[in-house]
Amino acid sequence: LVPHLGDREKRDSVCPQGKYIHPQNNSICCTKCHKGTYLYNDCPGPGQDTDCRECESGSFTASENHLRHCLSCSKCRKEMGQVEISSCTVDRDTVCGCRKNQYRHYWSENLFQCFNCSLCLNGTVHLSCQEKQNTVCTCHAGFFLRENECVSCSNCKKSLECTKLCLPQIENVKGTEDSGTT
């Protein structure tokens, strides 16, 4: 099966790498614009220069292209706790990230929110916090893991999944209740 190519890909494939086919004359291959620039005017003829202009402030192109406009710089999402790691330049988009001791949780492929790494109180660190993953905790005896926090077994209800982990404690509590003084 031949993969379906879009019109632009079909046109580009006729020219050697680093060139694109002139939109009005398919016998002409124009040189693509360097990153940090965009296409202002197509080359007038074979072997003649493409008119490329530098991206204006607040816009960029990160690779060679024949775009009629530069791309708008991304803005870091403050409401997601994001901070700017590096500013947008003409050839690179803004890089957003999280503060120290935070990790990213992705709500979608391109949208992340910053959260504080778990400290594993009443437990130990099994896996350290990473850029895209919270700390993995192992809880001490008498505690169970709930939403990656170590919670006392005294908060374990019989209907919850913690019953297996907290079974001795639950039995002890039950035994204490049953052995009332007469």
């Epitope: 979608s108 919270n134 926090e149």
Partner: nanobody, 116 residues
Framework: EVQLLESGGGLVQPGGSLRLSCAAS????????MFWVRQAPGKGLEWVSA????????YYADSVKGRFTISRDNSKNTLYLQMNSLRAEDTAVYYC?????????WGQGTLVTVSS
């Protein structure tokens, strides 16, 4: 077949509370972020809240922060939205959804009307 069924909407006075539920089936519920979105009369969709598979990570739109609480019970395949201190501007059809931003699956919605 993926199904999401919202319930719990109704008419409530300003300052009142409601708890919405969303029963999910047909997919591995505890593997997905889940979302509440709403649509006020004559307006577009607004992303209200989100919760991660474990329930540890949550997101709230500024308009509902401090008043709404999202939660989930993976053992019951159910998503919840506790809504307190309701305002007239919270009047909308509330939908639960999986996946953002395309919200590939969502329910039929439940209408919340805040009026005196």
């Amino acid at each position: 077949e993926v199904q999401l069924l919202e319930s719990g909407g109704g008419l409530v006075q300003p300052g009142g509370s409601l708890r919405l539920s969303c029963a999910a089936s047909g997919f591995t519920f505890d593997a997905y972020n889940m979302f509440w979105v709403r649509q006020a009369p004559g307006k577009g969709l607004e992303w209200v809240s989100a919760i991660s598979p474990s329930g540890r990570e949550t997101y709230y739109a500024d308009s509902v922060k401090g008043r709404f609480t999202i939660s989930r019970d993976n053992s019951k395949n159910t998503l919840y939205l506790q809504m307190n201190s309701l305002r007239a501007e919270d009047t909308a059809v509330y939908y639960c959804a999986k996946r953002y931003p395309d919200f590939d699956y969502w329910g039929q919605g439940t209408l919340v009307t805040v009026s005196s």
